[in-house]
Amino acid sequence: MAVTACQGLGFVVSLIGIAGIIAATCMDQWSTQDLYNNPVTAVFNYQGLWRSCVRESSGFTECRGYFTLLGLPAMLQAVRALMIVGIVLGAIGLLVSIFALKCIRIGSMEDSAKANMTLTSGIMFIVSGLCAIAGVSVFANMLVTNFWMSTANMYTGMGGMVQTVQTRYTFGAALFVGWVAGGLTLIGGVMMCIACRGLAPEETNYKAVSYHASGHSVAYKPGGFKASTGFGSNTKNKKIYDGGARTEDEVQSYPSKHDYV
């Protein structure tokens, strides 16, 4: 029962997380113009991984894609790569985890196969979450560095009469979405790995073996001894999914949430 709940919850949390990673990757507001201590401009600049946008006070918004590949900073390329790897791993993880769900029966799939698939998807979710967190953190670090560099520039080289206000950028909404989404995917992955331990059929009942001691007719029969590897409760003889808190119909509704992935 607890294993199914953990697995199901891990799947749902990871699903939300991956949807968030996709949303963050597509969002334009990775960095936004810093308005604090700045002259009030009638133009608001913000940038994403794929394009930069300008919103005018008139309400018009103009976005321009980064049509060059070689001309982009290596860090931006690295962030793009991390986010895409995170999405791909997450999507594969979701696909694998659907078939691994204990409440979904596919032919005569063994519990051991489901346990392996659960572990695989869990690891994929963990790596996916780490990729997203790393990508967002690299971008955030890049912003902080550039922010202080441009702040230094603002207060130097002002010898002339004409001032040129340098646009400084600060954290955009996408960074927070990315961090939260990456964290959720990571948590979901950990939950899947925990559920895997509960799914693994680790019990082995050793057959009784008679040891004939010389000169004695005493038989040692340690029958029923459980060899455990510390993976938790035995699931071989328990139908955990019977009478569980979640019906098959309810669980079947989850995959529809990630049709767009």
Epitope: T41, A42, V43, N45, V54, E56, F60, V162, T164
Partner: antibody
Framework: QVQLVQSGAEVKKPGASVKVSCKAS????????VHWVRQAPGQGLEWMGY????????KYSQEFQGRATLTSDKSASTAYMELSSLRSEDMAVYYC???????????WGQGTLVTVSS | DIVMTQSPDSLAVSLGERATINCKSS????????????LTWYQQKPGQSPKLLFF???TRQSGVPDRFSGSGSGTDFTLTISSLQAEDVAVYYC?????????FGQGTKVEIK
Amino acid sequence: QVQLVQSGAEVKKPGASVKVSCKASGYTFTSYVVHWVRQAPGQGLEWMGYINPYNADSKYSQEFQGRATLTSDKSASTAYMELSSLRSEDMAVYYCSRSYYGNSFDVWGQGTLVTVSS
Amino acid sequence: DIVMTQSPDSLAVSLGERATINCKSSQSLLNSGNQKNYLTWYQQKPGQSPKLLFFWASTRQSGVPDRFSGSGSGTDFTLTISSLQAEDVAVYYCQNDYYFPFTFGQGTKVEIK
């Protein structure tokens, strides 16, 4: 065609208030910001402020903050500019205009002359 | 506030001749986000409302004759009428559209010599 039609000329006494209307036609009123600009006789143009009819968001020039009130009526596709505590130096032609790319003003009303005289 | 300074205050040019109006802002009007200059040029004929000529310093508004051209970047801008026509007699204004409050130049009166 796109046009902004303003209310007629007004004569007011010092200390009074004036409310000028600007009716938009030929476009979706809520899709464009409306600015107000004034021009004293023989003088240059002076920006007063703007209102976004979509969300009633407004911004004022410091000089008119607290004295001018910009409002709009979506159902009537009309923007309003009310100026209180009128002084003789407020005598001017008041224009409404529609905001365009680059925060420029592409369509202007015909202007409303406000005369302040005791 | 941003100060917009136009020169000259008035200009008398012969028909068919070139007229050049300069506009200088106290701060750069170049937006780094889209590399566009937020400067607008207007024409105001006697007794009429202003008419938009150029936005983003050099983007011509539809219906504006191509004898008009706008140029410049940062703080220095120019409006040029390559061949002055009788109907071009007007006052020309530049406007800062980058910083609040939006400010206009004092205007340049163009007349026929």
